[in-house]
């Protein structure tokens, strides 16, 4: 298990911007304008435009609440004319540089509008959200703008009993069969679109790739499985000419695998989804939340997928069938038998045109019949190293993202940002071997659930964006000025932070900073190099005897012990003469004349099997 | 240049068989994705499809007349042919062949041959 | 269900806009086709997948599917659009393309 966060800032302790309208709630889409330096926000019945690098600055409001006659007759069907009632706002996508297209749960009727950006007018069009927004703000939806058509994962109905993966075009719109084996109860949690490889093969389509649990078609047992699921469908579908006529033809799904090896701790159930794309990195990887099922511990694992890993499923990958195996839990297996040509599911590509496959309507019944039968692969998608990055106890995930930094030396590191069911925000880095959690910032003043988060990676100015549903926190990467030695800073082991001697200040680290020389980091936690040693200062203190003193230190580091040392010699808690409060200030009983003297508390730090010692405070007593 | 012409008898006694063939030029039955169908229309009525195959062999049928349609192709020929069984005088009707298209703008009966009238009468 | 249902007729004025309307079930989850067909000749096909004009039909001809109707729009009406109009699908419960009922457009 992965070890505490090395440091806990409080809500107050950190520079940390908010942003909240008063009676405003559930701020839970987010989406940046990197070239505007706008974050919009959308909420129940609003959406804000606010200053990406202030977010408290508002710059345009625009309101889309739901009438009384509507709000009636959504009460009428039994929904909560409070809450339930009302315009959640659930998909928030760029549609050009001018506009947004919007949608909200509106009273249980799902409708879609474009936002005017220079007015900060909706125009009024009223589309109908069916399929692309959910009916309940309570269920699960996702979304993704790919040239300027609409992939959503969500409910298309007003029960939510008919699950949907959509793409809404004017052009060629596409759905997934209403059929138990392409989505059984799924509980969407993110969708994107993976470009082609420039230097993939020729012809290769863009794919959309969508995360999301299920209740497993494979195994039955008397309590419902859930099984985290990526699926994948082709840019380029058309859907089929006879045979799934208006469905996708490209629509694979396959099993996540995130469980600890030699152990029965599997995580299934998908909480967020983050795709890394940076310079350097040779393809994407997906890195994803997970908490088990029976979830009465508290656990929550972080798995990564290559691109290629994932492709390699659906592209080479076996698929599975539905099979009566009496007194059996498998309902499915293993297909062994003959696949048509072209392969079912795959894209339209340079290979497929070759062969006068020129779109997937000229795709063979055979293909088509066969993937409409056949949508679930029989491998699964494994992790990188085959393992969690990370497991952690006694907290619950709930969302992702990850930042590619370079350090001093030179090294790429990647660090996850990721939040909790309790307003915190966890950011830990994977090392060669470890994953070292770096810090937790308590984000919202009350404990209630990060419903989103986003990263802006611009350079010179990055910044974790996080919604709930009381306003939305922004907060830098790193707090390095909060580091006050070279040690503290050299063992925070954070690659955005690095011990300026020249300036005595643990400073943020910018890519592009020319005059880092002889700045100091060691994501190893290596601080021989801090030589600079603060100056020793003292605090004096005189008490009157039979009295009791309490000499204060203060110590971050949750990894480190605090020693208190008298005359050189350790003190223990265990003799009477002494006590600790809060494991860290001294209480010394019945002072004495003995009692006078230099006391030292130290902060001790393992790091890498190595003990890094820390004078922390020094104080002088003297007993009248 | 598209053309489909129908053949076949133009009377036909009731319990007998039909058979029709559709000879066509201007593309090939080989072509990924292209198929012939087969149509009819009874004198002042709608249009009822019947059968259809495609140039990978699949053949399709309309339900209510599944046990008593046959449609075959012969590609080096260009010709499709459809048998009907056991004729009775509500088969009395225009029957069409065509050609189906293929690809980003297909699905559509985009050729027609202008058809063949068969009357069944005893 | 594999019948689709079309009104049997449609008179419209000239310069007018004619609707011709077809419904069955779950029309929207498959691709409707329109025909048009003049006496003594096959048909010729005037809208296919819902909404997309082959070349050669005039702009006046637009489709529309949505929820269990697809609608036909002839604007601007001539009399050279009198004639039969059948709208088709492809039933996948039942792989078999099917017909519609057939509505006679006059132009008055």
């Known amino acids: 298990f992965a070890p505490v966060p090395r440091l806990t800032w409080e809500h107050g302790e950190v520079g940390l911007v908010q942003f909240h309208k008063p009676g405003i709630f559930n701020y839970s889409a987010l989406l940046m304008s990197e070239d505007k330096d706008t974050l919009y926000v959308g909420a129940r019945e609003a959406v804000f435009a606010v200053n990406a690098l202030n977010i408290s600055e508002k710059q345009h409001e625009v309101y889309w609440k739901v009438s009384e006659d509507k709000k009636s007759k959504c009460a009428e069907k039994g929904k909560s004319k409070q809450t339930e009632c009302l315009n959640y706002i659930r998909v928030l996508q760029p549609l050009s540089s001018t506009s947004l297209y919007v949608c909200g749960t509106n009273a249980f009727q799902p409708t879609c509008d474009h936002l005017n950006l220079t007015s900060f007018k909706f125009l009024g069009k009223s589309e109908d959200g069916k399929g692309r927004c959910p009916f309940d703000p309570a269920h699960s939806y996702t979304s993704v703008m790919v040239g300027g058509e609409l992939y959503s994962g969500t409910s298309y109905n007003f029960l939510g009993s008919e699950p949907i993966i959509s793409r809404n075009s004017s052009h060629s719109p596409l759905r997934t069969e209403y059929a138990i084996p392409w989505l059984n109860e799924p509980s969407f949690v993110f969708a994107d679109v993976i470009q082609k490889s420039p230097d993939g093969p020729e012809g290769e389509d863009d794919k959309v790739y969508f995360f999301f649990t299920e209740v497993s078609v494979e195994y039955e047992f008397v309590f419902k499985l859930m099984i985290p699921r990526v699926a994948r469908v082709c840019k380029g579908d058309q859907g089929g000419l006879r045979t799934l006529q208006k469905k996708w033809t490209s629509f694979l799904k396959a099993r996540l695998i995130c469980s600890k090896p030699d152990s029965g701790l599997v995580f299934n159930i998908l909480q967020d989804v983050f795709v890394l794309r940076a310079p350097g990195l040779k393809e994407p990887v997906f890195y994803a939340v997970f908490t088990p099922q029976l979830n009465n511990v508290g656990l929550s694992a972080v798995c990564a997928y290559t691109l290629a890993t994932v492709e390699a499923v659906f592209s080479r990958g076996k698929y599975m069938q539905s099979a009566t195996v009496e007194q059996s839990h498998t309902k499915w297996v293993r297909y062994n038998g003959p696949v048509p040509t072209p392969r079912p599911g795959a894209c339209i590509d340079s290979e497929a045109r070759a062969a006068n496959y020129t779109s997937s309507l000229n795709l063979p019944d055979k293909t088509l019949q066969f993937v409409k039968d056949h949508p679930l692969m029989d491998d699964s998608v494994t992790p990188i190293d085959n393992r969690p990055k990370l497991i952690k106890k006694d907290v619950n995930y709930t969302q992702i993202v990850v930042d590619r930094t370079q350090a001093l030396d030179g090294t790429f590191y990647d660090v996850m940002f990721i939040s909790t069911d309790r307003g915190a925000l966890h950011k830990a880095v994977i090392l060669t071997k470890e994953v070292h959690v770096i810090e937790e910032t308590q984000l919202f003043r009350d404990s209630e659930p990060v419903l989103t988060l986003l990263l802006s990676s611009k350079k010179g100015r990055k910044f974790v964006y996080a919604g709930s549903n009381s306003g939305v926190v922004q907060a830098p990467l790193a707090f390095c000025e909060k580091h006050g030695s070279c040690e503290d800073c050299v063992l925070a082991r954070d690659p955005y932070c690095a011990w300026s001697p020249a300036i005595k200040a643990c400073v943020t680290l910018h890519q592009e900073e020319a005059s880092s020389r002889g700045w100091i980091q060691d994501m190893s936690g290596d601080t021989s190099s801090c030589l600079d040693k603060s100056k020793e200062s003292f605090n004096q203190h005189f008490f009157k005897h039979g009295g009791t003193a309490e000499l204060k230190c203060f110590q971050k580091s949750n990894l480190a012990r605090v020693v208190w040392k008298f005359q050189n010699g350790e003190l223990k808690a265990a003799s009477p003469k002494y006590g600790f409060v809060g494991r860290k200030h001294l209480l010394i009983f019945n002072l004495s004349d003995g009692d006078s003297g230099v006391y030292q508390c130290l902060s001790e730090e393992r790091v890498r099997n190595k003990t890094v010692s820390q004078l922390l405070a020094k104080h002088v007593l003297e007993v009248k | 240049q598209v053309t489909l012409k129908e053949s076949g008898p133009t009377l036909v006694k009731p319990t007998q068989t039909l058979t029709l063939a559709c000879s066509f030029s201007?593309?090939?039955?080989?072509?990924?994705?292209?198929?012939v169908t087969w149509i009819r229309q009874p004198p002042g009525k709608a249009l009822e499809w019947l059968a259809l195959i495609d140039w990978d062999d699949d053949k399709y049928y309309s339900t209510s007349l599944k046990t008593r349609l046959t449609i075959s192709k012969d590609t080096s020929k260009n010709q499709v042919v459809l048998t009907m069984t056991n004729m009775d005088p509500v088969d009395t009707a225009t029957y069409y062949c065509?050609?189906?298209?293929?690809?980003?703008?297909?699905?559509?009966?985009?050729?027609w041959g202008q058809g063949t009238l068969v009357t069944v009468s005893s | 269900s594999s019948e689709l249902t079309q009104a049997p007729s449609v008179s419209v004025s000239p310069g007018q806009t004619a609707s011709i309307t077809c419904s069955g079930d779950k029309l929207d989850d498959k691709y409707v086709y329109w025909y048009q067909q003049k006496p003594g000749q096959p048909p010729v096909l005037v809208i296919y997948r819902d909404n997309k004009r082959p070349s050669g039909i005039p702009e006046r001809f637009s489709g529309s599917n949505s929820g269990n109707t697809a609608t036909l729009t002839i604007s601007a009406t001539q009399a050279l659009d009198e004639a039969d109009y059948y709208c088709q699908a492809w039933e996948s419960s039942s792989d078999q393309y099917v017909f519609g009922t057939g509505t006679k457009v006059t132009v008055l």
């Open positions: 065509a050609r189906i298209a293929s690809g980003d703008s297909g699905g559509y009966f985009a050729d």
């Open positions: 201007g593309f090939s039955l080989t072509t990924t994705g292209v198929a």
